[in-house]
Structures are given as structure tokens and as C-alpha cells.
């Protein structure tokens, strides 16, 4: 913008001001009407010095100066009038020139500034945008981190809480375990003492039982012998009485038969007049070797030699080949007579085999084979059976044809497995077959779905473990 102003300053002088945009131009001019009269030497329009001159020297000089001053004043007045007349024109011209020159420069500078400003603005805008993007991205990341941190903090708090709970639980359990350990150690000590006492008692009782068994056998044999002697005496007495009562009789001496004191099986014992069921001593055929067996003198006419019996699980039937060969257990309870004795016995005469079975529901059944024998040890005591009858199934639960005998240490079955180890006990396993009367003994209510129980498939089906079994033999011609 452009502006022209005329004003008076504080000293009374006139000043002319030209304002053009931010630039201001001031012109100061001398004033004639403010000059005083020279009536006093000190009041002249002379230039004032720093200090006044001496009066004598300066009077003449002042006179000259006054004349010059007068001329100058006249000239100045003319100049002033001239200026006053021409000022307006000149001022307009000056103003125009100044404005034009200033405008051109200012436009140039302005344009340059505008360009620079625009460039700077663009740069600033770009930077602002970048900063804004970066800020937004950082804010988002910060937000995500904040969320993650919150989650983690929550998880840590949860886990800490859980750990504290577990620690408390652990402490509680540790205490419980310690308490239980204490109790258990006490109980264990007590049980050990009881066990020791019981072992002593058992060993005492075992020796007492052995003695009683021996006495019983002796008593039974003695009783049987006495019965036989009594029977023989009665016959002799009767014979003598007959002879004495007969008038034509010749005196003769009654010849007694030689008394039989060794028995090959229970049938012979029965036939000898010993008809009470119990333990008897049998002698191996063609040998003096003896073996104790239980004789059943009651079932089906008596005379049965019991070769196997199960009733309560008191005897372990998972035995070695040697044990099954020689026999184990007690003839009064659970036992296996022995494969070698049975093989020798059944190899000499024809025997029948009767198998008696009991289930846990109070039922009984039997299978009867009209010919039974075991081959020798060289043939792994292979079983041979024919002629099945009875109530324990129409099909033989002992595989036909007969299988070799197998034990945990002698695998002679037809299975890719080892049946004796899998099913427990020694038996004439096939692969593995429908029966195993020497399996693991299971008590009532735990006797179903068993893979290794006392099994007779064609009576009770698979997995049913029986309560009691008895295998017994007798000569076919008894």
C-alpha cells in the first residue's frame, strides 16, 4: 500500500512522510516563519556553537554572517515557495517512481518468497503426512502392545494365581503324603511283625499238618489192613466152622492168599476193600517209587484216582515242566498228581477220564471220555481222548486230536504265541484251545471276561472262570 502524510513534529518543524508498504520515508525541511528578529546579538539566526565567542572578535563577523544569512533566507523562502508549488507534482512523480521500482522488486522478492514458501509448505506437508502416518502406525502398535501387555499381565496374574493354588494344593498334598507315609510305615512295621508271627505259626502248623497227614495215611492204611485182616479172619473162621460141622470133612489147613500191600491205582485199593475216600499211597508200575494220591471212593461207584483238583486258588498252577512232570500241591486240597505217573499208568491199561466241574451259580457238570491216555515225555505227554459223553458240552473242550502238554518253560502248542504264558498254567494247549483247567483262579464276581481263567468253553463259554474242577481216572473194566 502507499500513503502520503504531512505533519508537524514536537520542535515545530514540518515533516513529510511517504509510507509504502512496510517502508517509510521522512523528509525534514527548514521553517522561515519560526526564525526570530535579530534585535539582540544573542537572538540572531546564527548557528549556535558549543561555546559563545568573545564579543570583540565576533561583532564584525556576525555582521557579515547576518548579511549572508539574510541572502540565504531570501533564497530559502523562494525555494520554499518553489517547493510548495512543485511539491505535489514532484511527490506524485517520486511516489510513482518509488512505487514502481519498489513494486517490481517486491513482486520479484514476493514471487521468490512465495515459491520458496510453497516449496517449504509442500515439504512440510509431506513431512507432516509422513509424521502423521508414522504417528498413527506407532499409535496402533502402541495400542496393540498395550492390549498384548494387558493380556499378558492378565495371563501372568491368572498363572500366578494358579501357581499359588497349586503350591497350596501341593503343600496340602505333601503334608497328606507325609502323614500317610508315617501311618503306612507304622502299619508296615506292624504288618511285618504280624507276618513274621504268622510265618512262624504257619511253619509250625505245616509241620503239624504233615505229621497229621502221615498219621492219617498210616491210620487209613492200618484201618484198611485191619478191615482186610478181619475180613480174612472171618472167612477163615467160617471155613473152619464149615469144615468142623461137616462130618465127612478132611482135616485141612486153610491157605491164605498173600496180602497185597502195594496198589497201582485207587481202583485196586477200592477192590481191596478200602472204600473210604482219602489220601492213599500208589506205586509206579514196575517200580518201587511211590506217590500220594486222593482216591474218590464215592462218585459213580468209586475207585477214582484224582489227577487234578482246583477249589479255592490256594495253590499256584503256573509251574515248570519238571513240577508238572512230578506233581505238586496237596492231595487233600488243590494238586496235580504228575504227568509221568499218569503216563505210565494209562500206558499199561485202558482208562476212562472223568472231569467234574462246578460254576459260581451252584451248577455242576461233567465230561466222560471212555478212553484216555498220555504219551510219554518224549512226546510231551500228548493227550489222547475218545468217546465223549456227559453234561459239560457235546463237543470236547480238550482239542481233538490231542495236543502236546505245554508249561511256562516248555512251549509245545500250535500257537504263534506261548499259550502257557498267555493263559497261565500247564495244559494241553492247542492255539490255545477251548479249555484250561489249570488257569488262574478267580473268585466270584471277578470270574467273567477272563483271558487266563479256569476255562471249559463248551459248558460255560469263553472268559468264564470256574469255581471247582476235578480230573479223575479209573480202569475202563472197573
Amino acid at each position: 500500500y502507499s500513503n502520503f502524510r504531512k505533519s508537524v513534529d514536537s520542535t515545530g518543524r514540518r515533516q513529510y512522510q511517504v509510507q509504502n508498504g512496510p517502508c517509510s520515508y521522512t523528509f525534514l525541511l527548514p521553517e522561515t516563519d519560526s526564525c526570530r528578529s535579530s534585535s539582540s546579538p544573542y537572538m540572531s539566526n546564527a548557528v549556535q556553537r558549543d561555546a559563545p565567542l568573545d564579543y570583540d572578535d565576533s561583532v564584525q563577523r556576525l555582521q557579515v554572517l547576518e548579511n549572508i544569512l539574510e541572502n540565504n533566507t531570501q533564497w530559502l523562502m523562494k525555494l520554499e515557495n518553489y517547493i510548495q508549488d512543485n511539491m505535489k507534482k514532484e511527490m506524485v512523480e517520486i511516489q510513482q517512481n518509488v512505487v514502481q521500482n519498489q513494486t517490481a522488486v517486491m513482486i520479484e522478492i514476493g514471487t521468490s518468497l512465495l515459491n520458496q514458501t510453497a516449496a517449504q509448505t509442500r515439504k512440510l506437508t509431506d513431512v507432516e503426512a509422513q509424521v502423521l502416518n508414522q504417528t498413527t502406525r506407532l499409535e496402533l502398535q502402541l495400542l496393540q502392545h498395550s492390549i498384548s501387555t494387558n493380556k499378558l499381565e492378565k495371563q501372568i496374574l491368572d498363572q500366578t494365581s494358579e501357581i499359588n493354588k497349586l503350591q497350596n494344593k501341593n503343600s496340602f498334598l505333601e503334608q497328606k503324603v507325609l502323614d500317610m507315609e508315617g501311618k503306612h510305615s507304622e502299619q508296615l512295621q506292624s504288618m511285618k511283625e504280624q507276618k513274621d508271627e504268622l510265618q512262624v505259626l504257619v511253619s509250625k502248623q505245616s509241620s503239624v499238618i504233615d505229621e497229621l497227614e502221615k498219621k492219617l495215611v498210616t491210620a487209613t492204611v492200618n484201618n484198611s489192613l485191619l478191615q482186610k485182616q478181619q475180613h480174612d479172619l472171618m472167612e477163615t473162621v467160617n471155613s473152619l466152622l464149615t469144615m468142623m460141622s461137616s462130618p465127612n470133612s478132611k482135616s485141612s489147613v486153610a491157605i491164605r492168599k498173600e496180602e497185597q500191600t502195594t496198589f497201582r491205582d485207587c481202583a485196586e485199593i477200592f477192590k481191596s476193600g478200602l472204600t473210604t475216600s482219602g489220601i492213599y499211597t500208589l506205586t509206579f508200575p514196575n517200580s518201587t517209587e511211590e506217590i500220594k494220591a486222593y482216591c474218590d471212593m464215592d462218585v459213580g461207584g468209586g475207585g477214582w484216582t484224582v489227577i487234578q483238583h482246583r477249589e479255592d486258588g490256594s495253590v499256584d498252577f503256573q509251574r515248570t515242566w519238571k513240577e508238572y512232570k512230578e506233581g505238586f500241591g496237596s492231595p487233600l486240597g488243590e494238586y496235580w498228581l504228575g504227568n509221568e505217573f499218569v503216563s505210565q499208568l494209562t500206558g499199561q491199561h485202558r482208562y476212562v477220564l472223568k472231569i467234574q466241574l462246578k460254576d459260581w451259580e451252584g451248577n455242576e457238570a461233567h465230561s466222560l471220555y471212555d478212553h484216555f491216555y498220555l504219551a510219554g515225555e518224549e512226546s510231551n505227554y500228548r493227550i489222547h481222548l475218545t468217546g465223549l459223553t456227559g453234561t459239560a458240552g457235546k463237543i470236547s473242550s480238550i482239542s481233538q486230536p490231542g495236543s502236546d502238554f505245554s508249561t511256562k518253560d516248555s512251549d509245545n502248542d500250535k500257537c504263534i504265541c506261548k499259550c502257557s504264558q498267555m493263559l497261565s498254567g500247564g495244559w494241553w494247549f492247542d492255539a490255545c484251545g477251548p479249555s484250561n483247567l489249570n488257569g488262574q483262579y478267580y473268585p466270584q464276581k471277578q470270574n467273567t471276561n477272563k483271558f487266563n481263567g479256569i476255562k471249559w468253553y463248551y459248558w460255560k463259554g469263553s472268559g468264564y472262570s470256574l469255581k471247582a474242577t476235578t480230573m479223575m481216572i479209573r480202569p475202563a473194566d472197573f
Epitope: C415, M422, A431, C432, G433, Y457, S462, G463
Partner: nanobody
Framework: EVQLVESGGGLVQPGGSLRLSCAVS????????IGWFRQAPGKEREGVSS????????YYADSVKGRFTISSDNSKNTVYLQMNSLRPEDTAVYYC??????????????????????WGQGTLVTVSS
């Protein structure tokens, strides 16, 4: 204690399908073969299908070949019998049973019924219109 529980039986029309399940506990299917058997009223129990070796070996009776499919899920200890194109003569109580996988005769592939020692209670399948 070994337990086998059958499920999935029911009434279905001829030509229909059923899927039987046998949930086994107390043993692992890795070591045992599982067989499906059925018993119709007045008839002997007969083998239908068996599976062992994680499904590597399967057996089907001639009467069900092409219609029945046996499978097992060892992770669930469960054996399935998918029965398609059912006929009235398929009506029976269906049982599943277990046998130790190794209890095999030399040269044989499958097990006689008496070797299966653990049995379920059975599920009735009736095919009738």
C-alpha cells in the same frame, strides 16, 4: 476289568443302514483282536467280522462281504461295524468280543469263537418293514 459295550442297534427297514459301536475298556486295541458275532433266535452264535493290527487285517463272513465294513479308532478304543443293504436275515443280537491278537494257530488268519474270552452284552438289530 475288561469291559465291552455295544451300541447302535435298533429297528431298520430292509435296504437300510446301521452303524454299531463297541467301546472297549481294560485293554488296548493294539494288543487285541475284536470280533463281531451275531445270534439269531434259535440259532448258534456266528462270526460276522473281525479286525486286528490297527485295522491292518480284517475278516468278513461270506454272508456279509461287500455289505458290512469293520473299522477301529484306537484313540477312542472303539470298534465299529457299518452295516449297509440290511436284509431281514441280518436280524439278530450282535455281540463284540476280544481275543489276544497273538492267540493264532500257525498258518491261520483268524480265531475260533472259543478263543474270544471277553464279551459284551449285545445289541439287538431288527431288519423289518
Amino acid at each position: 476289568e475288561v469291559q465291552l459295550v455295544e451300541s447302535g442297534g435298533g429297528l431298520v427297514q430292509p435296504g437300510g443302514s446301521l452303524r454299531l459301536s463297541c467301546a472297549v475298556s481294560g485293554i488296548t486295541l493294539d494288543d487285541y483282536a475284536i470280533g463281531w458275532f451275531r445270534q439269531a433266535p434259535g440259532k448258534e452264535r456266528e462270526g460276522v467280522s473281525s479286525i486286528r493290527d490297527n485295522g491292518g487285517s480284517t475278516y468278513y463272513a461270506d454272508s456279509v462281504k461287500g455289505r458290512f465294513t469293520i473299522s477301529s479308532d484306537n484313540s477312542k478304543n472303539t470298534v465299529y461295524l457299518q452295516m449297509n443293504s440290511l436284509r431281514p436275515e441280518d436280524t439278530a443280537v450282535y455281540y463284540c468280543a476280544a481275543v489276544p491278537a497273538g492267540r493264532l494257530r500257525y498258518g491261520e488268519q483268524w480265531y475260533p469263537i472259543y478263543e474270544y474270552d471277553a464279551w459284551g452284552q449285545g445289541t439287538l438289530v431288527t431288519v423289518s418293514s
